[in-house]
């Protein structure tokens, strides 16, 4: 006889793991067989959908590989065409063991502030978040939280607070940890010993010590004056993330030294300045030497260009180096009475510093050239249409000296001072634009602040009358 | 007259190196710096790098150290930019260029490389 | 690195007009600044050497000032010819640095 469709066993609540298999059971008598079907949150499960198997007439349903978007309420539906249709339903609860989704990662940070270590997690039953710091559980307290989020809060990060961190997610069907991170804890530099001010006599030695602290260390830098320090010897020891720095400087003038500790946070850097004054008590003669010695310069001629008290080199490959040096200039002189405005005063700057080279005092007393840079300049730029009729003359032998060659820097072989500031003189009349000045300031013996990238530095060949520089 | 002659376009494909040479008459080679500039379609001038063709060094812009080489050739009055790991950022207009800032500054009439798979 | 702000990216004039481009260094740079004029298809021509001196060969209507980190390129009377690109460049240490360009345009 015809029956109406009866579920013998209802369907219940199912608990599977991710991946695994699920299965519900809807079993049914009647006659004829029904046609059974089954819905997931109301939706109708297609018989071709190949991540479930519907078996045993439509009564069992697997669902292959549990995926967390599983869960819902699933129900079959009994219908042979005797009476009504019957349903029965069930749940899947899809369990999950703990997985971290974010994890934390390398964090630098400046001691002081907020520091945010991220761990966002998954799981069913929710699991709950501990952190590790180097092999030991982490203690929370007012400046360590742990977040409802998983993620780890530092307030106020201190230095002792760098380390190796990983968050681990717990819940009743297992746990897991996340990487390691680290937590670098930067500082600002700061200088723990100034640089002492010193009143010495010329020609003396003197040390200047500057310590700083910081993380990452930081590096010093010394300026002299303003400029980057350009004579003088600085020997450098770094100890537990302080770095102390001295140097010894050869005084033939008064100063302002200045001890600059730096280092760099991201894209941003800190800084710490001290300075201190070196005044000169009394000034003692300049000891001669083979080659040439360092003295002040005493002419007429270059006294509107060089800077009061210069000290220049005088070559004593002459008899008389302070005459011949000022008759060279005076002949080259001469010749500039007829260049343009705009030519002269770069001519004269450029000429007076060719053949009264700023002096290095020292052991052996060094000239430095002119930088290359200035060199081109005055020759190409401001003095172009002068130079070509200069240098035309001079390869001709229409000047009345020989002597005079020397007043014509071949500019390719002077030091640059992108590669090597130390190793060359600038030109600051070129520092200074026109409007400025009713005059052009006096030459200075400062070197150019300029970055120095890290390259092999100018070699100079022993001095002769006009010496020559290459660049290795 | 001082003339700097560069070599033609190239295509390449990302990943692969690119030579651009620059070969200078009309003045002692030796005395004067060469720079590398670059100018991507539309885009503005980029500064690549130095070199001094007496001796070779070089000094190179952060964002292609270690990307790129550059090159003199004494002999034959040239110098070259290699670029290597090309990307297609890289498409562009390479120019040679005597001193830039300092002295008489003369240009070479580019050479276009096209980074394209 | 040595940044170079230029401003204004674009403008648009009439011929006869006086037009000024500024450039800012990110630190002083002292004088060592030069501007250059690019044309469609063509190289860059350099018009101003050393922040204030007129490159030879350059019109007077063409003039540099500023020193430090403040320089300013000024077109005093806009001719045809003067529409083009123009660029910063500093050379006061490696690496060297141009700025990212002004187009100047018929209004």
């Known amino acids: 006889l015809p029956k109406a469709p009866v579920i013998t066993t209802p369907l219940e609540t199912v608990d599977a793991l991710v991946e695994e298999v699920a299965t519900f059971m809807c079993a049914v008598e009647s006659y004829p067989q029904p046609e059974i079907s089954w819905t997931r949150n109301k939706i109708l499960i297609k018989l071709f959908d190949t991540r479930y198997s519907i078996r045993e007439n439509g009564q069992l349903l697997t669902i292959l590989s549990v995926e967390d978007s599983d869960d819902g309420i699933y129900c079959c539906t009994a219908n042979n065409g005797v009476g009504g249709a019957v349903e029965s339903c069930g749940a899947l609860q899809v369990k999950m063991k703990p997985k971290i989704t974010r994890p934390p990662i390398n964090v630098k940070i400046i001691e002081g502030l907020k520091a945010v270590l991220p761990c966002t997690t998954m799981g069913n039953p929710k699991p709950s978040v501990s952190w590790i710091k180097g092999d030991s559980p982490l203690r929370e307290n007012s400046r360590i939280a742990v977040l409802e989020s998983g993620s780890l809060r530092i307030h106020n990060v201190q230095k002792e607070d760098a380390g190796q961190y990983r968050c681990v997610a717990k819940n009743s069907l297992g746990t897991a940890y996340s990487k390691v991170v680290k937590l670098e804890v930067e500082v600002f530099a700061r200088i723990l010993r100034a640089p002492e001010s010193h009143n010495v006599t010329f020609g003396s030695f003197v040390t200047l010590h500057c310590t700083a602290t910081g993380i990452p260390v930081p590096t010093i830098t010394w300026i002299e004056n303003g400029n980057a320090v350009s004579s003088g010897s600085i020997q450098e020891s770094v100890k537990d993330r302080v770095i102390d720095s001295r140097l010894q400087l050869f005084i033939t003038k008064p100063g302002l030294y200045t001890c600059i500790a730096t280092n760099k946070h991201g894209e941003k850097f800190s800084t710490a300045k001290a300075a201190a004054t070196i005044s000169i008590a009394e000034w003692s003669k300049p000891q001669k030497d083979n080659k040439g010695y360092c003295a002040q310069y005493r002419g007429e001629v270059c006294n509107a260009v060089l800077a009061k008290d210069a000290l220049v080199f005088l070559n004593t490959s002459y008899a008389d180096p302070e005459e011949a040096q000022e008759l060279l200039v005076h002949t080259a002189w001469n010749e500039l009475k007829v260049v343009s405005p705009v030519c002269r005063p770069a001519a004269e700057a450029l000429l007076c510093n060719h053949i009264f080279q700023e002096c290095s005092p020292g052991v052996v007393p060094t000239p430095i050239p002119i930088c290359r840079e200035y060199c081109l300049a005055v020759k190409e730029l401001f003095c172009a249409k002068e130079w070509l009729v200069m240098e035309e003359k001079t390869h001709r032998g229409l000047y009345r000296s020989e002597m005079h060659l020397l007043s014509v820097p071949e500019c390719s072989k002077l030091p640059s001072m992108h590669w090597d500031p130390t190793a060359c003189a600038r030109l600051p009349h070129l520092d200074y634009n026109k409007e400025n000045l009713k005059t052009f300031p006096p030459m200075t013996s400062s070197k150019p602040s300029v970055d120095i990238p890290n390259l092999p530095s100018s070699s100079s060949s022993s001095f002769s009358v006009s010496p020559t520089y290459s660049m290795t | 007259q001082v003339q700097l002659v560069q070599s033609g376009a190239e295509v390449k494909k990302p990943g692969a190196s690119v030579k651009v040479s620059c070969k200078a008459s009309?003045?002692?080679?030796?005395?004067?710096?060469m720079h590398w500039v670059r100018q991507a379609p539309g885009q503005g001038l980029e500064w690549m790098g130095i070199?001094?063709?007496?001796?070779?060094?070089?000094s190179y812009a952060q964002k292609f150290q270690g990307r790129v080489s550059m090159t003199s050739d004494t002999s034959t009055s040239t110098v070259s930019m290699e670029l290597s790991s090309l990307r297609s950022e890289d498409t562009a207009i390479y120019y040679c260029a005597r001193e830039l800032g300092w002295g008489s500054d003369y240009w070479g009439q580019g050479t276009l490389v096209t980074v394209s798979s | 690195d040595i940044q170079m702000t230029q401003s204004p990216s674009a403008m648009s004039a009439s011929v006869g007009d006086r037009v000024t481009i500024t450039c800012r260094a990110s630190q002083d740079i002292r004088n060592y600044l030069a501007w250059f004029q690019q044309k469609p298809g063509k190289v860059p021509k350099r018009l101003i050497y050393i922040a204030s001196n007129l490159q030879s060969g350059v019109p007077s209507r063409f003039s540099g000032s500023g020193s430090g980190t403040e320089f300013t390129l000024t077109i005093s009377s806009l001719q045809p010819e003067d529409f083009a690109t123009y660029y910063c460049l500093q050379h006061n240490s490696y690496p060297y640095t141009f700025g990212q360009g002004t187009k100047l345009e018929i209004k």
């Open positions: 009309g003045y002692t080679f030796t005395s004067y710096y």
């Open positions: 070199i001094n063709p007496s001796g070779g060094s070089t």
